[in-house]
Amino acid sequence: FEIALPRESNITVLIKLGTPTLLAKPCYIVISKRHTTMLSIKPGERILFTFSCQSPENHFVIEIQKNIDCMSGPCPFGEVQLQPSTSLLPTLNRTFIWDVKAHKSIGLELQFSIPRLRQFGPGESCPDGVTYSISGRIDATVVRIGTFCSNGTVSRIKMQEGVKMALHLPWFHPRNVSGFSIANRSSIKRLCIIESVFEGEGSATLMSANYPEGFPEDELMTWQFVIPAHLRASVSFLNFNLSNCERKEERVEYYIPGSTTNPEVFKLEDKQPGNMAGNFNLSLQGCDQDAQNPGILRLQFQVLVQHPQNESNKIYVVDLSNERATSLTIEPRPVKQSRKFVPGCFVCLESRTCSTNLTLTSGSKHKISFLCDNLTRLWMNVEKNISCTDHRYCQRKSYSLQVPSDIFHLPVELHDFSWKLLVPKDRLSLVLVPAQKLQQHTHEKPCNTSFSYLVASAIPSQDLYFGSFCPGGSIEQIQVKQNISVTLRTFAPSFRQEASRQGLTVSFIPYFKEEGVFTVTPDTKSKVYLRTPNWDRGLPSLTSVSWNISVPRDQVACLTFFKERTGVVCQTGRAFMIIQEQRTRAEEIFSLDEDALPKPRFHHHSFWVNISNCSPASGKQLDLLFWVTLTPRTVDLT
């Protein structure tokens, strides 16, 4: 190899050992029979050399640095060449460095030809291995503007007082152009300006200078976004830290087209604007930091550009002004993310404060709009607390658990509407009475309606799930001892059509000791499947639950248990089942941990089934499934 550098080129070449590898044989640079591991070539020098091994790219790297002095003479502006040409260089990993020094009053602009640049953060790398590292200067301090790959949106970076640009090319890369040019501009009066150009839908992730370390104290950095007129942009902060300010306040400022309040100033912790049409600027302003405990300011954010939907021009009013203790959240459905670009899906408050999820609280009217390619990507969850503090006032008081019609006007699907029903401990209990009798969801007879009621304890320490219930069954009411949550969960968009079938009434009733009581009136046409609460996890320790099963006068009920034995093993206590005829009060008691369950049996009159659990050994829980069928009486047995 021969490398010759012209005397006035201001280029130095350095060949040195790269990161050490575990290769057995060492490799050397050979210059007139002398072996060395480092070679420096200065302007005006011409050197012939070879390598002592077959694959020097595994051992050495080459750095080509060109110093451009714009302080003492005119600047060589225009397209930057790779000098010496890559064809003259040995095939090593190579880094071209351009170090441009300029006056503070001079602005320097790096312009990147298509496919432009994409900034990447710590721990990431470029697919093709081609990397741009760009730094600026504040007095004598070097500031990292960022590291970039190809295929992005960054088209220009403006700085002042000097630029250091490093282009890293892997040894196998055929590239022979720098891909950028330098131009001079007037002073930008800030650390830097990064221009990001979107041609169509897409996203860009950008970072403050020195990221993930701290942004320089009291500095200003600006990003200019060029957005096609027919698209909308939304900003979301992925990660940020605030420093400890002594004077001034850290903030971001937006220049948004059409805004009457430019610049719009936001704190970093605020929701950032979305649904913006046209070009806009975003600036990060630092503060004077506390000398003793400065902390760090840093910001990583994303700009998402997408087509507006028809819905984004509509304003929806959600009136929660007459509601109490209610919150409505619109959020993304959980989905597997694909690797390709996915347009953002935002919900906007007052059209501008857009985010991926939004919670509205009771007591106000809210105006919302959507910026989303497909509104089925969102769903709605509502929580409402109904509590009783004074048992004398609440007793026998009833509330209707009904989804307000306002919610059906919104263009997103309702997922859950949860009512948290809270009662004074040991003073009152609750009864749920459905508008239509309920069916308990079981594997044997699953619910196939568009919605179900999920009933569970709302006591933090208690893991008790009564079950999932849907309209069209035999359960007339559910009584529960203490605090519960009732969640109406929808399973299909057809819920809007079936909404009339929903409706539960909750009443506060005198306190009782059992965890739950189900009142069941079987249908003559079908089997009623019933199962103990907490199915698959087992009825909680020492819990008692009952079923009050009505048998019509002209019918006989057959009670059948799914298994011969429960399989429960008691660590302490015994588990009992008591079947009691309501007319005669005659009862049969079964020790569930010791004895077999009864064979199918016939009841001519209404009866109770009560199950009281022990403290089961782990893995040997009490789960019981049984069913009731009615058949007409053939003989009058009264």
């Epitope: 020492l542 008691c570 079964f590």
Partner: antibody
Framework: EVQLLESGGGLVQPGGSLRLSCAAS????????MSWVRQAPGKGLEWVSA????????YYADSVKGRFTISRDNSKNTLYLQMNSLRAEDTAVYYC?????????????????WGQGASVTVSS | EIVMTQSPATLSVSPGERATLSCRAS??????LAWYQQKPGQAPRLLIY???TRATGIPARFSGSGSGTEFTLTFSSLQSEDFVVYYC?????????FGQGTRLEIK
């Protein structure tokens, strides 16, 4: 009123067998676990065996395991204790006792009604 | 097995006085302890279960307390018919075990 009446006691030679019966009335027999408890002359109470209400589980004291068998016939409201390989130390008054059902209930049995006892003497 | 130890073996008290019988378990039996009374020539009678719950028809002068390994049966005011033998029984673990008994006699 709960009544328990033991029968079948008597004198038997060591190595011999005896079958005690306990006839129950005044309660739904199949609902309740039952036990046998014995008392040697001038000594304290010693639990012997127990059986669950439907006969699905049986329990024995180590001193009688393998020699005594507890069983029940719920259709006849009767509890049994088959005693084989009898030893002199098995000499005692044998009481049959009914379990109390308390919900939630303890693992073992609490005896809330007792028979008057059947005397068993093992002697040559 | 769990060994139940009652103390004292015999307790002499005057009628009308207060008396306390003790029962100690060799390991914890939680509250799974019962007390029985046995009169001469009769079957035992259940007094207390669950360490402190009086059985049906048992007068209020009998009370039980304790949990774990230490239990007591207390008579608030002894009647003449109370001077008989008392047994404690644990039912926390198999086998069920009784104490050796305490005889209450008139002083």
């Amino acid at each position: 009123e709960v009544q328990l009446l033991e029968s079948g006691g008597g004198l038997v030679q060591p190595g011999g067998s005896l079958r005690l019966s306990c006839a129950a009335s005044g309660f739904t027999f199949s609902n309740y676990a039952m036990s046998w408890v014995r008392q040697a002359p001038g000594k304290g109470l010693e639990w012997v065996s127990a059986i669950s209400g439907r006969g699905g589980s049986t329990y024995y004291a180590d001193s009688v395991k393998g020699r005594f068998t507890i069983s029940r016939d719920n259709s006849k409201n009767t509890l049994y204790l088959q005693m084989n390989s009898l030893r002199a130390e098995d000499t005692a008054v044998y009481y049959c006792a009914k379990d109390i059902v308390v919900v939630p209930a303890a693992k073992g049995y609490v005896m809330d009604a007792w028979g008057q006892g059947a005397s068993v003497t093992v002697s040559s | 097995e769990i060994v139940m130890t009652q103390s004292p073996a015999t307790l002499s008290v005057s009628p009308g006085e207060r008396a306390t019988l003790s029962c100690r378990a060799s390991q914890s039996v939680s509250s799974n302890l019962a007390w029985y009374q046995q009169k001469p020539g009769q079957a035992p009678r259940l007094l207390i279960y669950g360490a402190s719950t009086r059985a049906t028809g048992i007068p209020a002068r009998f009370s039980g307390s304790g949990s774990g390994t230490e239990f007591t049966l207390t008579f608030s005011s002894l009647q003449s018919e109370d001077f008989v033998v008392y047994y404690c029984q644990q039912y926390n673990n198999w086998p069920l075990t009784f104490g050796q008994g305490t005889r209450l006699e008139i002083k």
